[in-house]
């Protein structure tokens, strides 16, 4: 093949090499950018910055090498458009630092930074951690900080991410109230902070106020939907990012629903209860307190993380006719109480049928809110005896 006279020349099926001295000062408009998987750049002393716009359109890029060039600054978001990047070689440039944000979200198998005049400060604590944890081939490079010493020796006791404290109201919050949250941010080199409110949706009207180091958030006209929803305060410094989530408890009265009994492994009378604080529960059977046993007991399903409603069953282990009747669930919290009742018939009384009648062999349960309802009988051509143990 004829030698390529251009600043950048194709290399393999999806690679590009740019090695002609001083030919580039940015990476805009590289030929065939959208299909490139490998980009090799060398001896480009005028290439001093790498920014977001430089790598736009290089979505397939996997290997990026910029060596022996003049790179002084790599923007924190420089690789936003190259999420598949797995090998990054920036050796022998003029980099003094590299933000943790630059590599965040990438799955780098290799990161080469040797031969740069790195300056040890808390901004390189993440890189020191990579070295400690053996990530990205960093330990083998034995990185030196210019004028100081090995990166491994950099003291890091003061290199912490921000500390966050979120103040929530201690007093009870009722539906319709306005709630003020305050996020206090402490730490060195604070850069950015804010709130993440994605879970809130229609739970309240949101108003943000203040800025570092004290962020305010007003949740106006709150609804009961706000319960169990995360309100997250975040902050970043040159070391990394910290997040703290809190939940606001909005008080509302107990409510309860009962559903038709269903036969599973045991029988189940399904229920749903809601309320904040979580209501206490009591079962009645035919108007009297039902004492739970290992044969009849309340069982809750795993609660959903982001809602107050609890679903469960009154479990009945092989119920008989003596368990037929009216079941009532009482739910109460300091803001109100509620009840719901349901009739359940698990089995007909075996001693209440006429010997002249056909023998009922199996029953479909009849659950209604009234006491009426006839068992469904199943006639069989072959008569046989049925013995029922009543316990």
């Amino acid at each position: 093949a004829a030698p390529c006279p251009d600043a950048c020349c194709p290399h393999g099926s999806s690679g590009l090499r740019c090695t002609r001295d001083g030919a580039l000062d940015s990476l805009h408009h590289l030929p065939g950018a959208e299909n490139l998987t490998e980009l090799y750049i060398e001896n480009q002393q005028h290439l001093q910055h790498l920014e977001l716009r430089d790598l736009r359109g290089l979505g397939e890029l996997r290997n990026l090498t910029i060596v022996k060039s003049g790179l002084r600054f790599v923007a924190p978001d420089a690789f936003h458009f190259t999420p598949r990047l797995s090998r990054l070689n920036l050796s022998f440039n003029a980099l003094e630092s590299l933000s943790w944000k630059t590599v965040q979200g990438l799955s780098l198998q290799e990161l080469v930074l040797s031969g740069n005049p790195l300056h040890c400060s808390c901004a390189l604590r993440w890189l020191q951690r990579w070295e400690e944890e053996g990530l990205g081939g960093v330990p083998e490079q034995k990185l030196q900080c210019h004028g100081q010493g090995p990166l491994a020796h950099m003291p890091n006791a003061s290199c912490g991410v921000p500390t966050l404290k979120v103040q929530v109201p201690n007093a009870s919050v009722d539906v319709g109230d306005d709630v003020l949250l305050r996020c206090q941010v402490e730490g060195r080199g604070l850069e950015q902070a804010g709130w993440i409110l994605t879970e809130l949706e229609q739970s309240a009207t949101v108003m943000k106020s203040g800025g570092l180091p004290s962020l305010g958030l007003t949740l106006a006209n709150v609804t009961s939907d706000l319960n169990r929803k995360n309100v997250t305060c975040w902050a970043e410094n040159d070391v990394g990012r910290a997040e703290v989530s809190v939940q606001v408890n909005v008080s509302f009265p107990a409510s309860v629903q009962l559903h038709t009994a269903v036969e599973m492994h045991h029988w189940c009378i399904p229920f749903s209860v809601d309320g904040q604080p979580a209501p206490s529960l009591r079962w009645l059977f035919n108007g009297s307190v039902l004492n739970e046993t290992s044969f009849i007991f309340t069982e809750f399903l795993e609660p959903a993380a982001n809602e107050t409603v609890r679903h469960g069953c009154l479990r009945l282990n092989q119920p008989t006719h003596v368990n037929n009747g009216n079941y009532t669930l009482l739910a109460a919290n300091p803001f109100g109480q509620a009840s719901a009742s349901i009739m359940a018939a698990f089995m007909d009384n075996p001693f209440e049928f006429n010997p002249e009648d056909p023998i009922p062999v199996s029953f479909s349960p009849v659950d209604t809110n009234s006491t009426s309802g006839d068992p469904v009988e199943k006639k069989d051509e072959t008569p046989f005896g049925v013995s029922v143990a009543v316990g």
């Epitope: 300056h119 400060s121 004028g147 100081q148 090995p150 003061s158």
Partner: antibody, heavy 119, light 106 residues
Framework: QVQLVQSGAEVKKPGASVKVSCKAS????????MHWVRQAPGQGLEWIGT????????SNAQKFQGRVTLTRDTSTSTAYMELSSLRSEDTAVYYC????????????WGQGTTVTVSS | DIQMTQSPSSLSASVGDRVTITCRAS?????LYWFQQKPGKAPKPLIY???NLASGVPSRFSGSGSGTDYTLTISSLQPEDFATYYC?????????FGGGTKVEIK
């Protein structure tokens, strides 16, 4: 014990150059960065630059770019600082100091070399 | 470059006095260093990484602070402590020094 011994006082004319030496002993010379700091009469301390004797990697403060050359001779464990195009405001005491990375500070200093620039 | 501002620039005190010198950085630094210098001598390290005493330094010297504000305290001034004190940062390149605080006998 660790010691840095500097060359003697110099008197130079404006426009001339001066080369100050700093001989290290008591430690592995090639392992620690050597820095140069100066102090004009009655003034504070001003950083000039640094060299890594292990590979001659060096850098200087912007103010001295193009006028300062830092070198070393590993065979004699000596670091050198050469300042060219001298002007009267370069009159100062010049110090070499080691950056001790185990505790992360300038732990040992040379005794200083007085450079006087006068016509 | 990070600017280091020391205050006061000079102070007069008596033997036995408690002396406090402050150093403010123009932006946040991880650590601060303090040096003592006597006339005609090289600077001598006193405190490294904000609060650690350098070898051979008496315990009456102490350092504290974080972010941009740091303090050197001499709990009970001794005759040999009359000197000029410098703070220095090396959090950000290049290393920079404060203008110095001269402690004189009252």
């Amino acid at each position: 014990q660790v010691q840095l011994v500097q060359s003697g006082a110099e008197v130079k004319k404006p426009g001339a150059s001066v080369k100050v030496s700093c001989k290290a002993s008591g430690y592995t010379f090639t392992t620690y960065w050597m820095h140069w700091v100066r102090q004009a009469p009655g003034q504070g301390l001003e950083w000039i630059g640094t060299i890594y004797p292990g590979n001659s990697d060096s850098s200087n403060a912007q103010k001295f770019q193009g006028r300062v050359t830092l070198t070393r001779d590993t065979s004699t464990s000596t670091a050198y600082m050469e300042l060219s195009s001298l002007r009267s405001e370069d009159t100062a005491v010049y110090y070499c100091t080691r950056f001790y990375y185990e505790d992360w500070y300038f732990d040992v200093w040379g005794q200083g070399t007085t450079v006087t620039v006068s016509s | 470059d990070i600017q280091m501002t020391q205050s006061p620039s000079s102070l007069s005190a008596s033997v036995g006095d408690r002396v406090t010198i402050t150093c403010r950085a123009s932006s946040s630094v991880s650590y601060l260093y303090w040096f003592q210098q006597k006339p005609g001598k090289a600077p001598k390290p006193l405190i490294y990484r904000t609060s650690n005493l350098a070898s051979g330094v008496p315990s009456r010297f102490s350092g504290s602070g974080s972010g941009t504000d740091y303090t050197l305290t001499i709990s009970s001034l001794q005759p040999e402590d009359f000197a000029t004190y410098y703070c220095q940062q090396y959090h950000s390149y290049p290393p920079t020094f404060g203008g110095g605080t001269k402690v004189e006998i009252k």
